[in-house]
Protein backbone atom coordinates (compact mmCIF):
# COMPACT_ATOMS: atom_id res chain seq x y z
CA UNK A 1 0.00 0.00 0.00
CA UNK A 2 1.42 2.94 -0.70
CA UNK A 3 0.61 6.98 0.65
CA UNK A 4 1.17 10.75 -0.68
CA UNK A 5 4.91 9.63 -2.38
CA UNK A 6 6.31 13.14 -2.14
CA UNK A 7 6.28 13.36 1.78
CA UNK A 8 5.22 9.95 2.67
CA UNK A 9 2.39 10.25 4.73
CA UNK A 10 -1.15 8.46 4.75
CA UNK A 11 -3.86 11.36 3.54
CA UNK A 12 -6.84 8.97 4.93
CA UNK A 13 -5.14 8.55 8.00
CA UNK A 14 -3.08 10.73 10.87
CA UNK A 15 -3.08 8.10 13.22
CA UNK A 16 -0.14 6.36 11.50
CA UNK A 17 4.03 6.12 11.10
CA UNK A 18 5.21 6.09 7.57
CA UNK A 19 8.22 5.11 5.80
CA UNK A 20 9.84 4.69 2.46
CA UNK A 21 10.30 1.26 3.42
CA UNK A 22 7.67 -0.72 0.92
CA UNK A 23 8.36 -2.41 -2.29
CA UNK A 24 11.02 -0.47 -4.07
CA UNK A 25 11.16 1.73 -1.71
CA UNK A 26 7.75 3.09 -1.86
CA UNK A 27 5.64 4.71 0.71
CA UNK A 28 4.38 2.36 3.22
CA UNK A 29 2.03 3.33 6.06
CA UNK A 30 1.28 1.00 9.41
CA UNK A 31 -1.44 2.31 11.95
CA UNK A 32 -0.37 3.14 15.27
CA UNK A 33 -1.33 0.92 17.92
CA UNK A 34 -1.52 -2.27 15.56
CA UNK A 35 1.42 -1.73 13.31
CA UNK A 36 -1.21 -2.93 10.50
CA UNK A 37 -0.17 -1.72 7.28
CA UNK A 38 -3.24 0.47 5.78
CA UNK A 39 -4.31 1.24 2.22
CA UNK A 40 -3.78 5.54 2.88
CA UNK A 41 -6.22 5.88 -0.62
CA UNK A 42 -9.30 5.17 1.66
CA UNK A 43 -10.66 4.76 5.08
CA UNK A 44 -9.44 2.94 7.61
CA UNK A 45 -11.28 0.35 8.98
CA UNK A 46 -12.64 2.23 12.44
CA UNK A 47 -11.05 -1.21 14.79
CA UNK A 48 -7.95 0.20 13.93
CA UNK A 49 -8.28 3.26 14.65
CA UNK A 50 -10.17 2.53 17.56
CA UNK A 51 -6.79 0.85 18.37
CA UNK A 52 -4.78 3.49 17.67
CA UNK A 53 -6.91 6.19 19.55
CA UNK A 54 -6.21 3.94 22.43
CA UNK A 55 -2.52 4.24 22.15
CA UNK A 56 -2.44 8.19 21.94
CA UNK A 57 -3.22 10.08 24.82
CA UNK A 58 -7.28 9.94 25.48
CA UNK A 59 -10.29 12.02 26.86
CA UNK A 60 -13.16 10.70 29.06
CA UNK A 61 -16.72 11.46 27.38
CA UNK A 62 -20.38 10.92 28.51
CA UNK A 63 -22.10 8.22 27.10
CA UNK A 64 -25.90 8.42 25.02
CA UNK A 65 -28.29 5.99 26.09
CA UNK A 66 -29.55 3.24 23.30
CA UNK A 67 -33.46 2.85 22.25
CA UNK A 68 -35.31 0.29 20.82
CA UNK A 69 -33.10 -2.42 18.87
CA UNK A 70 -31.13 0.97 17.39
CA UNK A 71 -27.70 0.69 19.64
CA UNK A 72 -25.78 4.14 19.92
CA UNK A 73 -22.19 4.01 20.17
CA UNK A 74 -20.66 5.29 23.52
CA UNK A 75 -17.96 7.18 21.41
CA UNK A 76 -16.45 3.13 21.35
CA UNK A 77 -13.50 4.22 23.77
CA UNK A 78 -12.13 0.94 23.92
CA UNK A 79 -9.19 -1.25 22.94
CA UNK A 80 -10.50 -3.62 20.42
CA UNK A 81 -9.16 -7.13 18.86
CA UNK A 82 -9.25 -6.47 15.27
CA UNK A 83 -8.75 -9.36 13.01
CA UNK A 84 -5.74 -9.70 10.55
CA UNK A 85 -8.16 -7.61 7.84
CA UNK A 86 -9.20 -5.04 10.66
CA UNK A 87 -11.72 -5.88 11.06
CA UNK A 88 -13.35 -5.75 14.62
CA UNK A 89 -13.33 -9.79 16.52
CA UNK A 90 -16.85 -10.84 17.70
CA UNK A 91 -15.59 -11.03 20.77
CA UNK A 92 -14.34 -8.32 22.78
CA UNK A 93 -12.78 -8.66 26.20
CA UNK A 94 -11.20 -6.30 28.98
CA UNK A 95 -7.98 -6.73 31.10
CA UNK A 96 -10.45 -8.18 33.76
CA UNK A 97 -11.85 -10.94 31.90
CA UNK A 98 -14.81 -9.26 31.32
CA UNK A 99 -16.02 -10.07 27.75
CA UNK A 100 -19.04 -9.45 25.47
CA UNK A 101 -20.00 -9.34 21.80
CA UNK A 102 -19.83 -6.68 19.20
CA UNK A 103 -21.33 -5.89 15.82
CA UNK A 104 -19.28 -4.75 12.28
CA UNK A 105 -18.96 -1.08 13.77
CA UNK A 106 -17.87 -2.48 17.15
CA UNK A 107 -20.63 -1.40 19.41
CA UNK A 108 -21.85 -3.77 22.09
CA UNK A 109 -24.71 -6.08 21.18
CA UNK A 110 -24.91 -8.21 24.02
CA UNK A 111 -24.31 -8.01 27.88
CA UNK A 112 -21.31 -8.48 29.34
CA UNK A 113 -20.20 -11.48 30.39
CA UNK A 114 -17.24 -13.93 31.46
CA UNK A 115 -14.46 -15.82 29.47
CA UNK A 116 -17.01 -18.62 28.61
CA UNK A 117 -19.04 -16.34 26.53
CA UNK A 118 -19.32 -16.91 23.01
CA UNK A 119 -20.12 -14.93 20.33
CA UNK A 120 -20.76 -17.43 17.20
CA UNK A 121 -20.18 -14.70 14.35
CA UNK A 122 -19.44 -10.83 13.56
CA UNK A 123 -23.46 -9.57 13.44
CA UNK A 124 -23.37 -7.01 10.47
CA UNK A 125 -24.67 -3.51 11.01
CA UNK A 126 -26.52 -2.89 7.70
CA UNK A 127 -27.97 0.16 8.50
CA UNK A 128 -27.04 3.72 10.07
CA UNK A 129 -29.17 6.75 10.97
CA UNK A 130 -26.65 9.89 11.75
CA UNK A 131 -29.06 12.04 13.38
CA UNK A 132 -27.82 15.40 13.16
CA UNK A 133 -29.22 19.53 14.51
CA UNK A 134 -28.06 22.43 12.61
CA UNK A 135 -27.49 25.52 14.15
CA UNK A 136 -29.89 28.04 13.55
CA UNK A 137 -29.91 29.77 10.01
CA UNK A 138 -31.53 32.41 7.76
CA UNK A 139 -33.92 30.04 6.55
CA UNK A 140 -34.43 26.25 6.12
CA UNK A 141 -32.21 24.58 3.46
CA UNK A 142 -33.36 23.11 0.20
CA UNK A 143 -34.12 19.26 1.12
CA UNK A 144 -32.92 18.60 -3.06
CA UNK A 145 -29.40 20.63 -1.99
CA UNK A 146 -29.04 19.51 0.98
CA UNK A 147 -29.30 16.13 -0.19
CA UNK A 148 -27.15 16.63 -3.45
CA UNK A 149 -24.41 17.93 -1.03
CA UNK A 150 -24.02 15.15 1.53
CA UNK A 151 -24.26 12.55 -1.14
CA UNK A 152 -21.20 14.17 -2.76
CA UNK A 153 -19.49 14.80 0.52
CA UNK A 154 -19.99 10.78 1.32
CA UNK A 155 -18.59 9.82 -2.03
CA UNK A 156 -15.38 12.46 -2.46
CA UNK A 157 -14.00 12.93 1.22
CA UNK A 158 -15.50 9.51 3.06
CA UNK A 159 -15.26 7.22 -0.94
CA UNK A 160 -18.61 6.29 0.06
CA UNK A 161 -20.61 5.43 -3.29
CA UNK A 162 -24.16 7.14 -3.24
CA UNK A 163 -25.95 3.98 -3.50
CA UNK A 164 -25.66 3.24 0.06
CA UNK A 165 -26.62 6.70 0.94
CA UNK A 166 -30.31 5.31 1.15
CA UNK A 167 -31.92 9.00 1.75
CA UNK A 168 -31.61 12.07 3.79
CA UNK A 169 -34.49 13.61 5.49
CA UNK A 170 -34.58 17.04 6.92
CA UNK A 171 -37.23 18.59 8.82
CA UNK A 172 -35.81 22.15 10.21
CA UNK A 173 -33.38 21.59 12.02
CA UNK A 174 -33.27 17.78 12.17
CA UNK A 175 -30.85 16.39 9.04
CA UNK A 176 -31.35 12.13 8.81
CA UNK A 177 -28.94 10.53 6.79
CA UNK A 178 -29.41 6.78 6.47
CA UNK A 179 -26.96 4.11 5.56
CA UNK A 180 -27.94 1.36 4.35
CA UNK A 181 -25.29 -1.14 3.03
CA UNK A 182 -25.78 -5.37 3.44
CA UNK A 183 -22.65 -7.83 2.85
CA UNK A 184 -23.50 -9.01 -0.50
CA UNK A 185 -23.87 -5.20 -2.06
CA UNK A 186 -20.30 -4.51 -1.62
CA UNK A 187 -17.90 -4.35 -4.02
CA UNK A 188 -14.44 -4.35 -4.28
CA UNK A 189 -13.22 -1.13 -3.16
CA UNK A 190 -16.63 -0.28 -1.65
CA UNK A 191 -16.30 1.68 1.51
CA UNK A 192 -17.85 0.22 4.74
CA UNK A 193 -20.50 2.05 5.87
CA UNK A 194 -19.26 1.85 9.53
CA UNK A 195 -15.98 3.21 8.56
CA UNK A 196 -17.55 6.01 6.63
CA UNK A 197 -20.08 6.74 9.69
CA UNK A 198 -17.21 6.97 12.26
CA UNK A 199 -14.85 9.33 9.94
CA UNK A 200 -17.96 11.64 10.06
CA UNK A 201 -18.61 11.46 13.35
CA UNK A 202 -15.09 12.24 13.73
CA UNK A 203 -15.25 15.27 11.38
CA UNK A 204 -18.68 16.79 12.71
CA UNK A 205 -16.92 16.54 16.59
CA UNK A 206 -13.78 18.69 14.96
CA UNK A 207 -11.70 16.09 15.47
CA UNK A 208 -11.20 15.19 11.68
CA UNK A 209 -8.59 11.98 11.09
CA UNK A 210 -7.58 13.41 7.83
CA UNK A 211 -3.67 14.44 7.05
CA UNK A 212 -2.98 17.76 6.85
CA UNK A 213 -6.69 18.35 4.81
CA UNK A 214 -8.59 21.14 6.68
CA UNK A 215 -11.73 20.25 8.80
CA UNK A 216 -15.39 19.60 7.73
CA UNK A 217 -16.58 22.97 5.71
CA UNK A 218 -20.13 21.92 4.93
CA UNK A 219 -21.70 24.43 2.73
CA UNK A 220 -25.31 24.00 1.19
CA UNK A 221 -25.33 26.80 -2.06
CA UNK A 222 -22.69 28.23 -0.18
CA UNK A 223 -24.70 29.09 3.08
CA UNK A 224 -22.49 27.48 6.20
CA UNK A 225 -24.06 24.19 7.62
CA UNK A 226 -22.89 23.89 11.51
CA UNK A 227 -23.99 20.31 13.44
CA UNK A 228 -25.29 21.25 16.92
CA UNK A 229 -25.23 17.48 18.04
CA UNK A 230 -25.38 14.13 16.31
CA UNK A 231 -26.55 10.78 17.36
CA UNK A 232 -26.12 7.61 15.52
CA UNK A 233 -28.12 4.39 15.87
CA UNK A 234 -26.66 1.23 14.50
CA UNK A 235 -29.34 -1.56 13.21
CA UNK A 236 -27.92 -4.67 12.97
CA UNK A 237 -28.89 -7.99 10.52
CA UNK A 238 -29.50 -9.80 13.53
CA UNK A 239 -31.12 -8.01 16.90
CA UNK A 240 -29.32 -6.94 19.61
CA UNK A 241 -29.29 -9.74 22.62
CA UNK A 242 -30.15 -7.91 26.31
CA UNK A 243 -30.88 -9.30 29.05
CA UNK A 244 -34.55 -8.05 30.23
CA UNK A 245 -32.91 -6.75 33.21
CA UNK A 246 -30.63 -4.01 31.10
CA UNK A 247 -34.14 -2.87 29.58
CA UNK A 248 -35.61 -1.31 32.70
CA UNK B 1 -8.04 -15.64 -15.95
CA UNK B 2 -10.58 -12.73 -15.81
CA UNK B 3 -12.43 -11.79 -19.13
CA UNK B 4 -15.30 -9.88 -20.74
CA UNK B 5 -16.70 -11.48 -23.80
CA UNK B 6 -19.44 -9.54 -25.51
CA UNK B 7 -21.73 -10.00 -28.18
CA UNK B 8 -20.78 -9.18 -32.02
CA UNK B 9 -21.25 -6.30 -34.14
CA UNK B 10 -24.74 -4.73 -34.58
CA UNK B 11 -26.28 -2.43 -37.84
CA UNK B 12 -29.45 -1.02 -36.68
CA UNK B 13 -31.72 2.08 -38.01
CA UNK B 14 -32.31 4.90 -36.42
CA UNK B 15 -34.83 5.12 -33.71
CA UNK B 16 -34.37 1.52 -33.30
CA UNK B 17 -32.66 0.10 -30.05
CA UNK B 18 -29.45 -2.11 -29.70
CA UNK B 19 -28.86 -4.80 -26.05
CA UNK B 20 -25.22 -5.68 -25.91
CA UNK B 21 -24.30 -8.05 -23.79
CA UNK B 22 -21.12 -9.09 -21.71
CA UNK B 23 -20.37 -12.24 -19.97
CA UNK B 24 -17.88 -12.58 -17.48
CA UNK B 25 -15.48 -15.50 -16.34
CA UNK B 26 -12.88 -16.20 -14.09
CA UNK B 27 -13.67 -14.18 -10.91
CA UNK B 28 -16.68 -13.77 -9.05
CA UNK B 29 -19.16 -11.62 -11.01
CA UNK B 30 -21.08 -10.03 -8.16
CA UNK B 31 -18.38 -8.82 -6.14
CA UNK B 32 -17.22 -6.00 -8.79
CA UNK B 33 -18.73 -3.29 -10.18
CA UNK B 34 -19.28 -3.39 -14.19
CA UNK B 35 -19.38 -0.48 -15.89
CA UNK B 36 -19.97 0.61 -19.93
CA UNK B 37 -17.99 2.65 -21.97
CA UNK B 38 -18.61 3.43 -25.85
CA UNK B 39 -16.01 5.11 -28.12
CA UNK B 40 -17.18 6.88 -31.34
CA UNK B 41 -14.79 6.49 -34.18
CA UNK B 42 -11.17 8.31 -33.89
CA UNK B 43 -12.81 9.71 -31.02
CA UNK B 44 -12.42 9.37 -27.02
CA UNK B 45 -13.90 7.52 -24.31
CA UNK B 46 -17.36 8.19 -22.89
CA UNK B 47 -18.66 6.81 -19.33
CA UNK B 48 -22.32 5.74 -20.08
CA UNK B 49 -23.24 3.81 -16.80
CA UNK B 50 -22.39 1.52 -13.83
CA UNK B 51 -24.04 -1.48 -12.02
CA UNK B 52 -23.66 -3.57 -9.19
CA UNK B 53 -24.38 -7.19 -9.72
CA UNK B 54 -24.75 -8.48 -6.37
CA UNK B 55 -28.07 -6.29 -6.18
CA UNK B 56 -28.70 -4.45 -9.78
CA UNK B 57 -28.14 -1.07 -8.72
CA UNK B 58 -27.67 1.40 -11.39
CA UNK B 59 -26.37 4.91 -11.98
CA UNK B 60 -26.17 6.82 -15.47
CA UNK B 61 -24.50 9.76 -17.52
CA UNK B 62 -27.55 12.33 -17.57
CA UNK B 63 -25.99 12.69 -21.17
CA UNK B 64 -28.34 9.74 -22.06
CA UNK B 65 -31.15 10.99 -20.91
CA UNK B 66 -33.68 7.99 -19.83
CA UNK B 67 -31.67 6.38 -23.51
CA UNK B 68 -29.41 3.72 -21.78
CA UNK B 69 -30.49 0.65 -19.63
CA UNK B 70 -28.14 -2.01 -17.76
CA UNK B 71 -28.92 -4.60 -16.77
CA UNK B 72 -27.61 -8.22 -15.64
CA UNK B 73 -28.03 -11.80 -15.21
CA UNK B 74 -26.44 -13.06 -12.01
CA UNK B 75 -27.17 -16.84 -13.32
CA UNK B 76 -24.75 -16.54 -16.30
CA UNK B 77 -22.79 -13.36 -15.12
CA UNK B 78 -23.89 -11.41 -18.00
CA UNK B 79 -24.19 -7.60 -17.85
CA UNK B 80 -26.32 -5.96 -20.72
CA UNK B 81 -26.37 -2.47 -22.22
CA UNK B 82 -29.63 -1.11 -24.22
CA UNK B 83 -29.58 1.64 -25.80
CA UNK B 84 -32.61 2.82 -27.59
CA UNK B 85 -33.94 5.78 -30.02
CA UNK B 86 -30.52 5.77 -31.74
CA UNK B 87 -29.55 7.88 -33.79
CA UNK B 88 -26.27 8.01 -36.32
CA UNK B 89 -24.07 9.70 -33.62
CA UNK B 90 -24.33 6.66 -31.00
CA UNK B 91 -22.52 5.08 -34.17
CA UNK B 92 -19.36 3.87 -31.26
CA UNK B 93 -17.55 0.79 -29.99
CA UNK B 94 -19.39 -0.01 -26.56
CA UNK B 95 -17.50 -1.93 -23.80
CA UNK B 96 -17.95 -3.37 -20.79
CA UNK B 97 -15.19 -2.98 -18.14
CA UNK B 98 -14.77 -4.11 -14.55
CA UNK B 99 -14.59 -1.58 -12.03
CA UNK B 100 -13.21 -0.92 -8.29
CA UNK B 101 -15.04 0.53 -5.84
CA UNK B 102 -12.54 2.93 -4.51
CA UNK B 103 -10.37 4.24 -7.44
CA UNK B 104 -13.29 3.62 -9.92
CA UNK B 105 -10.41 2.30 -12.64
CA UNK B 106 -11.12 0.07 -15.00
CA UNK B 107 -9.03 -3.07 -14.93
CA UNK B 108 -10.29 -5.53 -17.35
CA UNK B 109 -12.26 -4.75 -20.32
CA UNK B 110 -14.44 -6.52 -23.04
CA UNK B 111 -13.08 -6.91 -26.39
CA UNK B 112 -15.74 -4.16 -27.73
CA UNK B 113 -18.98 -4.16 -29.77
CA UNK B 114 -19.01 -2.15 -32.93
CA UNK B 115 -22.74 -0.50 -33.23
CA UNK B 116 -23.14 1.21 -36.08
CA UNK B 117 -26.58 3.36 -37.04
CA UNK B 118 -27.42 4.54 -40.17
CA UNK B 119 -30.73 4.46 -42.46
CA UNK C 1 -19.05 17.48 -14.36
CA UNK C 2 -15.78 17.51 -14.08
CA UNK C 3 -13.56 18.41 -17.16
CA UNK C 4 -10.45 16.26 -18.10
CA UNK C 5 -7.83 18.13 -20.66
CA UNK C 6 -4.75 16.05 -21.67
CA UNK C 7 -1.46 17.89 -23.57
CA UNK C 8 -0.36 17.53 -25.82
CA UNK C 9 -2.73 15.61 -28.12
CA UNK C 10 -0.76 14.08 -30.00
CA UNK C 11 3.41 13.83 -29.55
CA UNK C 12 5.90 12.33 -31.96
CA UNK C 13 9.02 10.88 -29.93
CA UNK C 14 11.92 7.99 -30.67
CA UNK C 15 12.77 4.70 -29.20
CA UNK C 16 14.42 5.31 -25.46
CA UNK C 17 13.30 8.78 -25.37
CA UNK C 18 11.78 9.80 -22.40
CA UNK C 19 8.32 11.44 -22.56
CA UNK C 20 6.05 12.64 -20.51
CA UNK C 21 2.05 13.43 -20.59
CA UNK C 22 -0.43 15.78 -18.31
CA UNK C 23 -3.61 15.46 -17.23
CA UNK C 24 -5.10 18.52 -15.77
CA UNK C 25 -8.80 18.22 -13.93
CA UNK C 26 -11.29 21.07 -13.90
CA UNK C 27 -11.25 20.64 -9.96
CA UNK C 28 -9.32 18.99 -7.15
CA UNK C 29 -9.70 15.28 -7.66
CA UNK C 30 -7.49 14.22 -4.73
CA UNK C 31 -5.43 11.40 -6.51
CA UNK C 32 -8.25 9.73 -8.16
CA UNK C 33 -6.63 9.99 -11.56
CA UNK C 34 -6.23 6.42 -13.98
CA UNK C 35 -3.98 6.29 -16.81
CA UNK C 36 -5.08 3.85 -20.36
CA UNK C 37 -2.89 2.73 -23.46
CA UNK C 38 -4.99 1.69 -26.26
CA UNK C 39 -3.60 0.63 -29.20
CA UNK C 40 -5.49 0.71 -32.50
CA UNK C 41 -8.62 -1.59 -32.91
CA UNK C 42 -7.90 -3.04 -29.41
CA UNK C 43 -9.68 -2.03 -25.85
CA UNK C 44 -7.88 0.15 -23.08
CA UNK C 45 -5.81 -1.38 -20.84
CA UNK C 46 -5.39 -0.10 -17.44
CA UNK C 47 -1.92 1.06 -16.57
CA UNK C 48 -1.79 3.46 -13.72
CA UNK C 49 -4.37 3.88 -10.89
CA UNK C 50 -4.38 6.50 -7.91
CA UNK C 51 -2.33 8.62 -9.55
CA UNK C 52 0.72 6.48 -9.27
CA UNK C 53 -0.07 3.17 -8.53
CA UNK C 54 1.37 0.56 -11.28
CA UNK C 55 -1.06 -2.23 -12.25
CA UNK C 56 0.10 -5.61 -12.14
CA UNK C 57 2.53 -6.55 -14.96
CA UNK C 58 2.52 -3.02 -16.45
CA UNK C 59 6.30 -1.93 -17.09
CA UNK C 60 8.08 0.05 -14.04
CA UNK C 61 9.14 2.27 -17.19
CA UNK C 62 5.70 3.87 -16.55
CA UNK C 63 5.25 5.61 -13.39
CA UNK C 64 2.73 8.23 -12.84
CA UNK C 65 2.12 11.49 -10.36
CA UNK C 66 0.76 14.75 -9.00
CA UNK C 67 -2.54 15.77 -6.75
CA UNK C 68 -5.20 17.84 -6.76
CA UNK C 69 -5.67 18.80 -10.38
CA UNK C 70 -2.35 18.49 -12.15
CA UNK C 71 -0.85 15.27 -13.08
CA UNK C 72 2.06 13.53 -15.43
CA UNK C 73 2.53 10.06 -16.86
CA UNK C 74 6.52 9.61 -17.61
CA UNK C 75 7.25 6.89 -19.54
CA UNK C 76 11.42 6.67 -18.72
CA UNK C 77 12.67 4.91 -21.89
CA UNK C 78 10.26 4.48 -24.92
CA UNK C 79 9.95 1.06 -26.41
CA UNK C 80 8.16 0.57 -29.84
CA UNK C 81 5.26 -1.33 -28.15
CA UNK C 82 4.71 2.67 -26.32
CA UNK C 83 3.05 3.95 -29.50
CA UNK C 84 -0.14 4.25 -28.59
CA UNK C 85 -2.91 6.60 -27.10
CA UNK C 86 -3.28 7.29 -23.53
CA UNK C 87 -5.76 8.46 -21.87
CA UNK C 88 -6.33 9.72 -17.84
CA UNK C 89 -9.90 9.40 -16.05
CA UNK C 90 -10.73 11.03 -13.24
CA UNK C 91 -12.77 8.67 -10.19
CA UNK C 92 -12.81 11.53 -7.42
CA UNK C 93 -16.49 12.96 -7.66
CA UNK C 94 -20.07 11.44 -8.29
CA UNK C 95 -20.81 9.70 -11.50
CA UNK C 96 -20.27 10.41 -14.28
CA UNK C 97 -16.59 9.77 -14.02
CA UNK C 98 -14.75 11.41 -17.22
CA UNK C 99 -11.95 10.31 -19.18
CA UNK C 100 -9.35 12.77 -21.02
CA UNK C 101 -9.50 13.07 -25.30
CA UNK C 102 -6.68 11.42 -25.16
CA UNK C 103 -2.70 11.48 -26.60
CA UNK C 104 -1.78 9.52 -29.17
CA UNK C 105 2.50 8.56 -29.39
CA UNK C 106 3.69 8.09 -32.55
CA UNK C 107 7.32 7.58 -33.92
CA UNK C 108 9.36 10.34 -34.81
Known amino acids: HTAAQDNCTCPTNKMTVCSPDGPGGRCQCRALGSGMAVDCSTLTSKCLLLKARMSAPKNARTLVRPSEHALVDNDGLYDPDCDPEGRFKARQCNQTSVCWCVNSVGVRRTDKGDLSLRCDELVRTHHILIDLRHRPTAGAFNHSDLDAELRRLFRERYRLHPKFVAAVHYEQPTIQIELRQNTSQKAAGDVDIGDAAYYFERDIKGESLFQGRGGLDLRVRGEPLQVERTLIYYLDEIPPKFSMKRLT | QVQLVQSGAEVKKPGASVKVSCKASGYTFTSYWMHWVRQAPGQGLEWMGE????????SYNQKFKGRVTITRDTSTSTAYMELSSLRSEDTAVYYC????????????WGQGTLVTVSS | DIQMTQSPSSLSASVGDRVTITCRASQDISNYLNWYQQKPGKAPKLLIY???RLESGVPSRFSGSGSGTDFTLTISSLQPEDFATYFCQQGYTLPPYTFGQGTKLEIK
Open chain 2, 97 to 108: ARGHGNYVSFDY
Open chain 2, 51 to 58: ITPSDGYT
Open chain 3, 50 to 52: YTS
